[in-house]
Amino acid sequence: KNAVPPVIHSPNDHVVYEKEPGEELLIPCTVYFSFLMDSRNEVWWTIDGKKPDDITIDVTINESISHSRTEDETRTQILSIKKVTSEDLKRSYVCHARSAKGEVAKAAKVKQKVPAPRYTVELACGFGATGGGSGKPIPNPLLGLDSTGLNDIFEAQKIEWHEHHHHHH
């Protein structure tokens, strides 16, 4: 079997790490390395193009390594910031991987969670239900959710409104 360059499974373009300041940010970097004799496999993170040690933020990186029966290797490095700041949420987080077959990199999509807007829905029986203050955020079409995901969120939102409605009776 021919060895190939490393493959980064995570982060990817389909997952957005949306956090509020004060929350913990956890970003896994999962890389598959096909077996190659004497190859030095490496995985590392850069933050704003720099080594995490050179950035004045409290960041920890934990690594785990697993091997398949064919001696292929999967390395996972989890970058974690215990209490993320709004400044941290604007930084560029890039996972890099290198083997004798080549070097690859992928950026994590990190964003600050926008507080859900408050809005009022006029219910048939005359009560007004206010949503958006709690529960799931209003779906953001930019987050790359597929239509099923959006439907799930809309359904959940409808249930919240429904419960709110009955709560008034």
């Epitope: 850069t46 193009g49 560029s92 950026a107 990190v110 930019l142």
Partner: antibody
Framework: EVQLQQSGAELVKPGASVRLSCTSS????????MHWVKQRTEQGLEWVGR????????QYAPNFQDKATITVDTSSNTVYLQLSSLTSEDTAVYYC??????????????WGQGTLVTVSP | DIQMTQTTSSLSASLGDRVTISCRAS??????LNWYQQKPDGTVKLLIY???TLHSGVPSRFSGSGSGTDYSLTISNLEPEDIATYYC?????????FGSGTKLEIK
């Protein structure tokens, strides 16, 4: 394909203002900080500033704090650079560019073709 | 601001030559250095980032090295399309700063 298309050359009078545009295609502008640099004839590149199109937050090099204003119109995927109180020192080619990776990475991979601004009476 | 000095403003070499372009920072920049190529028509391209990482699509005849304050870009086998001006750029400290450029010409 990532493309940055800048507006055409400008000839402006001293003391006036000018607004340059940079229209992007092939990517979501909200995903990348957008930057501008200045290049005077036979001189190096000088970083002007950048904008986060997601929320409009800007940052400028100290030399351009009172000279440049960067704005964005996400609906048209366009970033603007406004230069005010123009003098002959502002005569230069201005480039917009985008980082290689999502957000604010410092590896400037995609550049516009440049806009020449000439300040002359 | 960190000053980036490219002492050789122009360089003349023959096709096939190995060419080295140097760049010096006014303080240690911890390898946070990129190289750009600007063609005579004004087109700018990223060649190398973080001192030695080749940007995708850049020919392997380009390589970068250095540490501390001294960095270099090497073209191992000069081709006609390499005629351009080369700029170094540091991102160690704000604001990002660029060298004044080294113009490469064919003998």
């Amino acid at each position: 394909e990532v493309q940055l298309q800048q507006s055409g050359a400008e000839l402006v009078k001293p003391g006036a203002s000018v607004r340059l545009s940079c229209t992007s295609s092939g990517f979501n502008i909200k995903d990348y900080f957008m930057h501008w640099v200045k290049q005077r004839t036979e001189q190096g590149l000088e970083w002007v500033g950048r904008i986060d199109p997601e929320d409009g937050e800007t940052q400028y090099a100290p030399n351009f704090q009172d000279k440049a204003t960067i704005t964005v119109d996400t609906s048209s995927n366009t970033v603007y650079l406004q230069l005010s109180s123009l003098t002959s020192e502002d005569t230069a080619v201005y480039y917009c560019f985008r980082p290689l990776y999502y957000g604010n990475s410092p590896w400037f991979a995609y550049w516009g073709q440049g806009t020449l601004v000439t300040v002359s009476p | 601001d960190i000053q980036m000095t490219q002492t050789t403003s122009s360089l003349s070499a023959s096709l096939g030559d190995r060419v080295t372009i140097s760049c010096r920072a006014s303080q240690d920049i911890s390898n946070y250095l990129n190289w750009y190529q600007q063609k005579p028509d004004g087109t700018v391209k990223l060649l190398i980032y973080y001192t030695s990482t080749l940007h995708s699509g850049v020919p392997s005849r380009f390589s970068g090295s250095g540490s501390g304050t001294d960095y270099s870009l090497t073209i191992s086998n000069l081709e006609p399309e390499d005629i351009a001006t080369y700029y170094c750029h540091q991102y160690s400290k704000f604001p990002p700063t660029f060298g004044s450029g080294t113009k490469l010409e064919i003998k």
